[in-house]
């Protein structure tokens, strides 16, 4: 779970240890602030929960790519 130390900076201290299917993910944001102990990705899931993930993991990178493509594809 992300932690807002001094709003508006949100940091992740632990990463999920379980892969989440991209079907269960709605969006993401990257955490790159120097005020945070580590770089992270925060996924927002289909049930509006925010989950911290390790950007070095392949599934995280693949999920971000997939969500990027979804965003770029106009809904008809």
């Amino acid at each position: 779970q992300p932690d807002a130390i001094n709003a508006p900076v949100t940091c992740c201290y632990n990463f999920t240890n379980r892969k989440i299917s991209v079907q269960r993910l709605a969006s993401y944001r990257r955490i790159t602030s120097s005020k945070c102990p580590k770089e992270a990705v925060i996924f927002k899931t289909i049930v509006a929960k925010e989950i911290c993930a390790d950007p070095k993991q392949k599934w995280v990178q693949d999920s971000m790519d997939h969500l990027d493509k979804q965003t770029q594809t106009p809904k008809t």
Partner: antibody
Framework: QVQLVQSGAEVKKPGSSVKVSCKAS????????ISWVRQAPGQGLEWMGG????????NYAQKFQGRVTITADESTSTAYMELSSLRSEDTAVYYC????????????WGQGTLVTVSS | EIVLTQSPATLSLSPGERATLSCRAS???????LAWYQQKPGQAPRLLIY???DRAEGVPARFSGSGSGTDFTLTISSLEPEDFAVYYC??????????FGQGTKVEIK
């Protein structure tokens, strides 16, 4: 510890409806779903459908579409399964089971409710 | 709908023997979203394995799951008397369409 407690056994006439409840305690309803699974005597498990309470919409197996209604009341942490136009083949134990909507495995199960359809 | 086919239907073994149960999917099970359950007579099913190979809390180490794609296996390394039961596989790729296998009964030889 999460517990799912189901309503008691029912005996119903063919053509009627039955509504089974499933009350969750010891955990949050927020990002979880409830599935309903039935098991006819001596048979295997059959997924009927499920609901994620915060979505307020349910999904149903094609076989039961139009005959089953699954709902959930977040305020009481209770899920319901109503099956209509009952026939003898609907005699079964009906289970509710919880799943995390981020995944899907059924980690906690109710004790089961026996529904007997007989004239 | 993804159809799961379990084999064999019945497995007759003695305590201490190794049990190998198979579950084959009609389509690719992405993200290895496949679980195994144990059910004893008169009881609700109990989750054993999720994500194809992760043991659920409190499940003994003699139970292990493996596989990906369309072929999955549940192995019980050395059967204990309490392991004689029916085992079901379950796919949960799509939240709107779960399915179960028809079950494998592990009985005492």
């Amino acid at each position: 510890q999460v517990q799912l407690v189901q309503s008691g056994a029912e005996v119903k006439k063919p053509g009627s409806s039955v509504k089974v409840s499933c009350k969750a305690s010891g955990g949050t309803f927020s990002h979880y779903g409830i599935s309903w699974v039935r098991q006819a005597p001596g048979q295997g498990l059959e997924w009927m459908g499920g609901v994620i309470p915060i979505f307020h919409t349910a999904n149903y197996a094609q076989k039961f579409q139009g005959r089953v209604t699954i709902t959930a009341d977040e305020s009481t942490s209770t899920a319901y399964m109503e099956l209509s136009s009952l026939r003898s083949e609907d005699t079964a134990v009906y289970y509710c089971a919880r799943y995390d909507a981020h995944y899907g495995e059924l980690d906690f199960w109710g004790q089961g409710t026996l529904v007997t359809v007989s004239s | 709908e993804i159809v799961l086919t379990q084999s064999p239907a019945t497995l007759s073994l003695s305590p201490g023997e190794r049990a190998t149960l198979s579950c084959r999917a009609s389509q690719h099970v992405s993200d290895a979203y496949l679980a195994w359950y144990q059910q004893k007579p008169g009881q609700a099913p109990r989750l054993l394995i999720y994500d194809a190979s992760d043991r659920a809390e409190g499940v003994p180490a003699r139970f292990s799951g493996s596989g990906s794609g369309t072929d999955f296996t549940l192995t019980i390394s050395s059967l204990e008397p309490e392991d004689f039961a029916v085992y079901y596989c379950h796919q949960y790729i799509h939240l709107h369409s779960f399915t179960f296998g028809q079950g494998t009964k592990v009985e005492i030889k």
